[in-house]
């Protein structure tokens, strides 16, 4: 079958990081510098990506596979591939359309990216808050104050997870 | 003191090709990147295209894909940039400009005129 | 491609005058946004770099600001000399873009 079809198909013979040529008898030529083709058989090359203002080179392109980026210092990627880079903030700040601003009191973020998310209510769970909450880190949830009566254990099994809630004020 | 020379003004026919060269002094010229503006009459600045004189890495505003060449000859400090099939709407003064970020110093300009 | 966005086209202004320009990205581009100055016969110069930084040798009246999608080129007291067009660009990513320019004529 493979014999047949490129009996019927010339370009099926054309390998990776090559071009099925219409101009030339449909002869495979080389892809074009800064252009790649990653399968066989392919009429045109792709135009190779390009890695420049906030993005920078993390793998370059060959005749066979496009260039890979990702983001200057200060910048993380977003989106299949990198194909956005959205600045860092501090721990304990959020981006927002006019930059970086602190955590609204309640709310913390552990990251240099994302958003600031409400502490967990300990409250939820019967439990006490053991550390608080800073703009940051989350609240440490202790046990209930049943919990610490004389003769009731102290280890506390793992709470199931759930969406954090707003801790008393 | 950094500085981007040009060469001089070109009329060419439509079909022809030019190459308009940037010779750059008083910095290290494989450190930064060249870039290529154009700016028809009264119109305003189109970005071309990038190349790196350093590896010789180029890359092209997709319109211009096909028809422009970037290349440079270290031993010169000089930059050039070749436009092929020339043709009416090509009209304009092209200019390199040096990258750093922004484009922080720019040629003087180089007239090409399209005209049969 | 990010489209760049320049108001008002054109403006006319005194000497003295305080003169703002907006830039508007079609998506954000942090703070990779450059300000030009060209005036007729001339290459374009570098006035502001990353949004609100400014060039070397550039005047302190002209400032920059914003951050994402909205920018704002300010001349606090326009000079005879400003009188020019102005173009934003970006340098987020390729293609690299420039917007329409602003032309600051003499009232």
């Known amino acids: 079958f493979e014999r047949t079809r490129s009996l019927q198909d010339p370009c099926s013979n054309c390998p990776a990081g090559t071009f099925c040529d219409n101009n030339r008898n449909q002869i495979c030529s080389p892809c074009p510098p800064n252009s790649f083709s990653s399968a066989g058989g392919q009429r045109t090359c792709d135009i190779c990506r390009q890695c420049k203002g906030v993005f920078r080179t993390r793998k370059e392109c060959s005749s066979t596979s496009n260039a890979e980026c990702d983001c200057t210092p200060g910048f993380h990627c977003l989106g299949a591939g990198c194909s956005m880079c959205e600045q860092d903030c501090k721990q304990g700040q959020e981006l927002t359309k006019k930059g970086c601003k602190d955590c609204c009191f309640g709310t913390f973020n552990d990251q240099k990216r994302g958003i600031c998310r409400p502490w967990t209510n300990c409250s939820l769970d019967g439990k006490s808050v053991l550390v608080n909450g800073t703009k940051e880190r989350d609240v440490v949830c202790g046990p209930s104050p049943a919990d610490l009566s004389p003769g009731a254990s102290s280890v506390t099994p793992p709470a199931p997870a759930r969406e954090p809630g707003h801790s008393p004020q | 003191q950094v500085q981007l020379v040009q060469s001089g003004a070109e009329v060419k026919k439509p079909g022809a090709s030019v190459k308009v060269s940037c010779k750059a002094s008083?910095?290290?010229?494989?450190?930064?990147?060249i870039n290529w503006v154009r700016q028809a009459t009264g119109q305003g600045l189109e970005w071309m295209g990038w190349?790196?004189?350093?590896?010789?890495?180029?890359g092209y505003v997709q319109k211009f894909q096909g028809r422009v060449t970037m290349t440079r000859n270290t031993s010169i400090s000089t930059a050039y940039m070749e436009l092929s099939s020339l043709r009416s709407e090509d009209t304009a003064v092209y200019y390199c400009?040096?990258?750093?970020?922004?484009?922080?110093?720019w040629g003087q300009g180089t007239l090409v005129t399209v005209s049969s | 491609d990010i489209q760049m966005t320049q108001s008002p086209s054109s403006l006319s202004a005194s000497v003295g005058d305080r003169v703002t320009i907006t830039c508007r990205a079609s998506?954000?581009?942090?703070?990779?946004l450059n300000w030009y100055q060209q005036k007729p016969g001339k290459a374009p110069k570098l006035l502001i770099y990353?949004?609100?930084s400014l060039q070397s040798g550039v005047p302190s009246r002209f400032s920059g600001s914003g951050s994402g999608t909205d920018f704002t080129l300010t001349i606090s007291s326009l000079q005879p000399e400003d009188f020019a067009t102005y173009y934003c660009?970006?340098?987020?990513?390729?293609?690299?873009?420039f917007g329409p320019g602003t032309k600051v004529d003499i009232k």
């Open positions: 190349m790196n004189p350093n590896s010789g890495n180029t």
């Open positions: 998506q954000s581009i942090s703070i990779y």
């Open positions: 660009q970006q340098s987020y990513s390729t293609p690299f873009t």
């Open positions: 008083g910095y290290t010229f494989t450190s930064y990147d």
């Open positions: 990353g949004a609100s």
């Open positions: 400009a040096r990258e750093t970020g922004p484009f922080d110093y």
